[in-house]
């Protein structure tokens, strides 16, 4: 028997520095977690103790903090090289700055293979990107070889900016021939490493003949066997065992997100490359694990540029940006409109001639808007200003919901109106009218939504049975502020870009902004 240790991360999302327990900015260092310096300590400890170790990343290193905003992926290559990752799969967020934003900072700088079998380049890009990412890679580990085959969510064109010269194929269809090729090369230990979410990970384990282990990402899935060590609730045991169609037991793993855990999976193979046993658990990277001093020193060196960036002007406002709780928790506020407009703008993807865009709607809890921005400071808007407005380090995500769920959400928005509570929704691509004289749960009297399958966007009444795409904060997608119906009834959820980054990019693009209050939210009773 031959034993392999797989160390794995996924959806790190730019958390190079240690974070608080909820993966936001570290405040009390003695209680902070994760970060590449701490990760390196644990990885090195395992490498010294065990003979056959692979360190893998299942995608979405890009996007999530000011580190990515400033360094644009150079930080990912630098610190992944320093940690000596063995391979990485492309995630959807690796395309956030377009193909060039992937090639230059990451693909050309990585000292490790970057993989995806189901992304096919065409046109002029085919030769430009040839060899910079691979469908698979065979890696020597001790006296054996291990094949690693990559995959990426086929939804990437709707979630990021891969352009028109990359085709995202069905994962299973694309993986099978590559696995077959590895078999003909006498590689009998094969890991599928990819970024399509836990449901697809399980399907790959079930359907792709020859895959021995699946290491996934995208869905931020936390798996654990035994008593979990922090706040995350396990979605299943680690590893999650799938019985393949040809009768094999295939371990599937994922390690939550944000570098909070290091996935740790031990696999025992027989001489024919069959998995005999698999066990392990994610390792919580808490403060009991010291940060490596040399990596920490390097982080501090790179940090300097971030501090300078946060005070630079992004653009100007010529109007007061009303982000006060007195406004945003009671009525339409222009800060809410600005943020929602930025959220939609960030999700412009012309992927189908029939649609002007794939999504037109935004909802945003008023309680998530934490500060106004005064225009009387020469109109200057900085990252620092936006960090006061959006201090929680969240993301603006894409969900699919039925019209009936949206209606419930808007009823919840005003079910206890008047108490300055955070669930009051700011909107984009939606016209809502409330009648507060009616009983809670029956206060939405009009709800019109902007069409997407149209050449001239216009507002049509919401249809209860129709499925709509909506951009919203991850806080709402996870049922925050009492929006349990969103969490329970959503049909699809894809993580999006860092909230501040979305708004800062929009302001930089627009240069001068002047958002108005324009009748998106109305009250039909005279007293409002």
């Amino acid at each position: 028997a031959w034993e392999l240790t797989i160390l794995h991360t996924n959806d790190v999302h730019s958390r190079l520095e240690q974070t608080s327990e909820d993966s936001s900015k570290c405040v009390n260092a003695s209680r902070c977690m994760g970060g590449v310096a701490r990760l390196f300590t644990k990885v090195q400890q395992i490498r010294r103790a065990e003979p056959n170790v692979l360190l893998l990343d299942a995608g979405d290193q890009y996007q999530g903090t000011i580190w990515f905003t400033v360094y644009k992926g150079a930080e990912v290559a630098h610190f992944m090289n320093a940690l000596r990752y063995d391979a990485m799969a492309l995630g959807n967020h690796e395309f956030d700055n377009g193909v060039e934003g992937l090639i230059e900072p990451l693909l050309k700088e990585a000292k490790f293979p970057i993989l995806s079998a189901n992304i096919k380049a065409k046109g002029p890009l085919a030769s430009q990107i040839s060899g910079l990412y691979l469908p698979y890679k065979v890696l020597p580990v001790g006296d054996e070889v291990v094949g690693i085959v990559g995959y990426t969510s086929k939804e990437t064109p709707f979630l990021s900016n891969p352009g028109t010269n990359l085709v995202f194929e069905d994962e299973i269809t694309a993986l099978q021939p590559e696995v077959d090729k590895l078999k003909t090369l006498n590689v009998n230990k094969i890991i599928a490493l990819g970024h399509s979410g836990f449901e697809m990970d399980k399907l790959i384990a079930q359907k792709v003949r020859g895959v021995d282990v699946v290491v996934g990402g995208h869905s931020n899935t936390f798996l654990y066997t035994g008593n979990p060590p922090s706040k995350e609730v396990p979605a299943g045991k680690y590893p999650f065992i799938v019985t393949s169609d040809d009768g094999r037991k295939v371990p599937v793993v994922q390690a939550y997100a944000f570098g909070k855990y290091l996935g740790y999976l031990k696999i025992e193979f027989d001489e024919r490359g069959n998995v005999i046993s698999s066990h392990g658990n994610p390792i919580l990277l808490n403060s009991s694990i010291p940060e490596d001093p040399s990596i920490k020193a390097d982080i501090n060196k790179w940090r300097i540029k971030l501090d300078n960036y946060s005070t630079q002007e992004l653009g100007k406002t010529i109007v007061y940006l009303d982000g006060s709780s007195q406004s945003c928790r009671f009525r339409e506020c222009n800060m809410g409109n600005l943020i929602c407009d930025a959220m939609i703008n960030n999700n412009l993807r012309h992927t189908d001639e029939m649609f002007w865009n794939h999504v037109s709607m935004c909802i945003l809890n008023g309680g998530g808007i934490r500060s106004p921005i005064d225009e009387r400071n020469n109109g200057t808007i900085t990252w620092e200003n936006l960090a006061a407005v959006l201090p929680f380090g969240g993301t603006f995500d894409l969900v699919q919901l039925k019209g009936s769920t949206l209606k419930k959400a808007f009823e919840h928005s005003v079910h206890r109106y008047g108490q300055s509570t955070g669930e009051f929704l700011q909107v984009g691509g939606i016209h809502v009218v409330y009648d507060l004289s009616r009983k809670p749960g029956d206060r939405v009297v009009k709800l019109d939504v902007l069409c997407t399958k149209c050449r001239v966007p216009s507002y049509d009444p919401l249809k209860m049975d129709e499925v709509y795409k909506v951009i919203l904060p991850n806080f709402l997608a996870n049922g925050g502020d009492g929006f349990q119906m969103i969490k329970d009834e959503l049909l699809r959820h894809d993580s999006g870009d860092q909230d501040i980054n979305v708004v800062s990019t929009y302001i930089s693009k627009m240069k001068v902004i002047y958002p108005a209050v324009e009748g998106r939210i109305k009250f039909s009773t005279g007293s409002h």
Partner: antibody, heavy 117, light 107 residues
């Protein structure tokens, strides 16, 4: 297949400059950094620097920073090394090498530069 | 700069022999080590990068191992075409630096 074809031998006087070329074929030139390395008789190999052909970004060995200039002509898929203020110690074989995963991988055949009065 | 020390500087062996060449770095280079081969008047040919990964087309009799500061190149069964000079280089940090070479000669 990847090929790097370097220009012919050069004989130069001390104080002069020399410009060497390295023509790439078999891959997209702008997709990979190019290293330059030299090997003087009886000395160990020395890394001069490297260049990113897509944007002209360079990294130099401190030792050569003041005298070496790396450039590219994207349309000709060619990388250049210019070395100024030549001295006898610059007599060496100069190599270009494509960078893969950070390391020199495919090498040119080399250009002999002789500096002699 | 990181110093790379190669040993032996020369080595005599016969066809079919197993040969080991070592390379030591003056500091931890995180496995970012390449081995390449050079024959007189020819372009160098990279064989192995990142300590143990063979480049395409390199015969499997070549293998690499090591970590931290100590690395080895092994040729499991020497072939006539393997007689050449072998070099290591580190690419962990700039400037890239090279070993002094090991000349492998026919006994």
């Amino acid at each position: 297949q990847v090929q790097l074809v370097q220009s012919g031998a050069e004989v130069k006087k001390p104080g002069a400059s020399v410009k060497l070329s390295c023509k790439a074929s078999g891959y997209t030139f702008t997709s990979y950094w190019m290293h330059w390395v030299r090997q003087a008789p009886g000395q160990r190999l020395e890394w001069i620097g490297n260049i990113n052909p897509s944007n002209g970004g360079t990294k130099y060995n401190e030792k050569f920073k003041s005298r070496a200039t790396l450039t590219v002509d994207k349309s000709a898929s060619t990388a250049y090394l210019e070395l100024s203020s030549l001295r006898s110690e610059d007599t060496a074989v100069y190599y270009c090498a494509r960078r893969d995963y950070g390391s020199p991988s495919y090498w040119g055949q080399g250009t002999t530069v002789t500096v002699s009065s | 700069d990181i110093q790379m020390t190669q040993s032996p500087s020369s080595l005599s062996a016969s066809v079919g022999d197993r040969v080991t060449i070592t390379c030591r770095a003056s500091q931890d280079i995180n496995s970012y080590l390449t081995w390449f081969q050079q024959k007189p008047g020819k372009a160098p040919k990279s064989l192995i990068y990142r300590t143990n990964i063979l480049l395409d087309g390199v015969p499997s009799r070549f293998s690499g191992s090591g970590s931290g500061t100590d690395f080895t190149l092994t040729i499991s069964s020497l072939q006539p075409e393997d007689f050449a000079t072998y070099y290591c280089l580190q690419y962990h940090e700039f400037p890239v630096t090279f070993g002094g070479g090991t000349k492998l000669e026919i006994k």
